[in-house]
Amino acid sequence: TAATQQDFFTPNLFLKQMLERYQNNSPPNNDDQWKNNGVTKTWDRLMLQDNCCGVNGPSDWQKYTSAFRTENNDADYPWPRQCCVMNNLKEPLNLEACKLGVPGFYHNQGCYELISGPMNRH
């Protein structure tokens, strides 16, 4: 049971934190702003380094209410720019295709399955 609870809670804690804090530019206080900036930087680095998107995948940004969605119209950005497939200069291979959701131009895999392997081994 404990393992099942961990499997349920861990990704959901990641998801809750990401949805609430990622690109949240209107926090109630400075401490929250500092936390939001930290979460945003961490997720940006994770998505760029591991070629992944969100916790479970790009649909996280569309399925749930989030600070990111408040800041970005869905028609403009279905998911963060860091979800786009990048070239060797770390620029989107084809930003137009990424924003339009053309397969192969954005990362389909969620980040949790990539980071949960190393976490579960400890």
Epitope: D76, Y77, N87, L93, N94, E96, L100, G104
Partner: antibody
Framework: QVQLQQPGAELVRPGSSVKLSCKAS????????MHWVKQRPIKGLEWIGN????????YYNQAFKDKATLTVDKSSSTAYMQLSRLTSEDSAVYYC??????????????WGQGTLVTVSA | DIVMTQSPSSLTVTAGEKVTMSCKSS????????????LTWYQQKPGQPPKLLIY???TRESGVPDRFTGSGSGTDFTLTISSVQAEDLAVYYC?????????FGSGTKLEIK
């Protein structure tokens, strides 16, 4: 039907700037990125960059990063490209172009007639 | 940047002849996400803007005569005109439509004897 209207020609002085226009009609302007392409007799076709009219986001070919500035005016469904610090190398035909369909990001299916820019003292 | 190399630079043929022109890219244009090659062919007649002929390397744009055929995958592509007509006099360009910056080949000029 889809139309991209561009002025026929612009004569400009070296060192000055010029703002080229591309007026779109026959479709929802916000739904399609606008692309700009340069053509010179020897150099052929060069892709300058593109702009998303819905939010103004741009992507530039590095070769044109300091030369071209892309903007849009949603109220008049017009895309603009400003070229700065003009030299004889900037004398060319400049086209605006749009994708063929909203779902696909590839192939430029609609083109303006092009604006001939002549840089001369 | 992806470099697009077209050959030959020009060719002169008689009406009714079969013509093939080549386009090679310095990197693969195959998108593994949808298994499509992001290679486009355009035809440009004197005094006109380029006109879309073929996209995804082999899909003919509606209204384009079936004598025009695109083929190839990855880095090697070919445009074939099965029976050249007088109105096919033009420059033909291939374009990388896969990654920024989108790049064009230098063109193949088709002349009719």
């Amino acid at each position: 039907q889809v139309q991209l209207q561009q002025p026929g020609a612009e004569l400009v002085r070296p060192g000055s700037s010029v703002k080229l226009s591309c007026k779109a009609s026959g479709y929802t302007f916000n739904s399609y990125w606008m692309h700009w392409v340069k053509q010179r007799p020897i150099k052929g076709l060069e892709w300058i960059g593109n702009i998303d009219p819905s939010d103004g986001e741009t992507y530039y070919n590095q070769a044109f990063k300091d030369k071209a500035t892309l903007t849009v005016d949603k109220s008049s469904s017009t895309a603009y490209m400003q070229l700065s610090r003009l030299t004889s190398e900037d004398s060319a035909v400049y086209y605006c172009a749009r994708r063929g369909t909203a779902q696909a990001t590839t192939w430029l299916g609609y083109w303006g007639q092009g604006t001939l820019v002549t840089v001369s003292a | 940047d992806i470099v697009m190399t077209q050959s030959p630079s020009s060719l002169t043929v008689t009406a009714g002849e079969k013509v093939t022109m080549s386009c090679k890219s310095s990197q693969s244009l195959l998108n593994s996400g949808n298994q499509k090659n992001y290679l486009t062919w355009y035809q440009q007649k004197p005094g006109q803007p380029p006109k879309l002929l073929i996209y995804w390397a082999s899909t003919r744009e509606s209204g384009v005569p079936d004598r025009f055929t695109g083929s190839g995958s990855g880095t090697d592509f070919t445009l074939t005109i099965s029976s050249v007509q007088a109105e096919d006099l033009a420059v033909y360009y291939c374009q990388n439509d896969y990654s920024y910056p989108f790049t064009f080949g230098s063109g193949t000029k088709l002349e009719i004897k």
